[in-house]
Interface confidence: medium
């Protein structure tokens, strides 16, 4: 018979024959032959594989480093990775939760809408027209542009969401 060019689901093609993939939680030891099945072995204590696979090495479970403020939210199994979270009152810096911050800062151009609490992170909002923030801060709101008129000055440089207006003296018409 013709050697296969494609295999069924949960199989892979090798040496012109279809071998079974290893199930999640197991790694490949040896490919199947005409006479033997694929040989698989369970992953070790701190390892996992989460798909049907032909990997010869299992992946290491993620380490929740307490020096980065991390702790284990869900212990890994042979089929799943460990899930990390931050210590109480702290917040993940990304969806993958690779490190923690006490509370996020709002970048220049953004102000704090709500200061962080033990359970919620800082909420930032863009500074609207007429307001600015020139600092990265976990506390400061957007500040209103300086009103040059109230100081009997004129706007020399327009403000942005990151900078205040620059005021200057009015041009006096010479007689």
């Amino acid at each position: 018979p013709e050697p296969p060019t494609a295999c069924r689901e949960k199989q892979y093609l090798i040496n012109s024959q279809c071998c079974s993939l290893c199930q999640p939680g197991q790694k490949l030891v040896s490919d199947c032959t005409e006479f033997t099945e694929t040989e698989c072995l369970p992953c070790g204590e701190s390892e996992f594989l989460d798909t049907w696979n032909r990997e010869t090495h299992c992946h290491q479970h993620k380490y929740c480093d307490p020096n980065l403020g991390l702790r284990v939210q869900q212990k890994g199994t042979s089929e799943t990775d460990t899930i990390c979270t931050c210590e109480e009152g702290w917040h993940c810096t990304s969806e993958a939760c690779e490190s923690c911050v006490l509370h996020r800062s709002c970048s220049p151009g953004f102000g704090v809408k709500q200061i962080a609490t033990g359970v919620s992170d800082t909420i930032c909002e863009p500074c609207p027209v007429g307001f600015f923030s020139n600092v990265s801060s976990a506390f400061e709101k957007c500040h209103p542009w300086t009103s040059c008129e109230t100081k009997d000055l004129v706007v020399q440089q327009a403000g942005t969401n990151k900078t205040d207006v620059v005021c200057g003296p009015q041009d006096r018409l010479r007689a």
Partner: nanobody, 116 residues
Framework: EVQLLETGGGLVQPGGSLRLSCAAS????????MQWVRRAPGKGLEWVSA????????YYADSVKGRFTISRDNSKNTLYLQMDSLRAEDTAVYYC?????????WGRGTLVTVTS
């Protein structure tokens, strides 16, 4: 490399005072908000206080408001925490932290013990 060194901790009686210092190096100190954070024995971390880069704006946790005062001297790259009317529940290791409080920008901490 960012380095933060806290000093000034010690043993004090309830109602007493202590002044903590944090010497900073490895970054432009005045550009950053700085924080004090503490960890009581067997408890999680608790944010205590923060101060803006220019030192004009200060922020406090409700548990220390009116008793603690945060300040900074940008010419000396140093952060301070004046702690008055100390209580037993203020016993903790106190850390200063740069800006966001990323764990990798922390000092080793200084232990404050309030006991009679």
């Amino acid at each position: 490399e960012v380095q933060l060194l806290e000093t000034g901790g010690g043993l004090v009686q309830p109602g007493g005072s202590l002044r903590l210092s944090c010497a900073a190096s490895g970054f432009t100190f005045e550009w950053y908000e700085m924080q004090w954070v503490r960890r009581a024995p067997g408890k999680g971390l608790e944010w205590v206080s923060a101060i803006s880069g220019d030192g004009y704006r200060t922020y406090y946790a409700d548990s220390v408001k009116g008793r603690f005062t945060i300040s900074r001297d940008n010419s000396k790259n140093t952060l301070y925490l004046q702690m008055d009317s100390l209580r037993a529940e203020d016993t903790a290791v106190y850390y200063c932290a740069k800006e966001l409080g990323y764990f990798d920008y922390w000092g080793r901490g200084t232990l404050v013990t309030v006991t009679s």
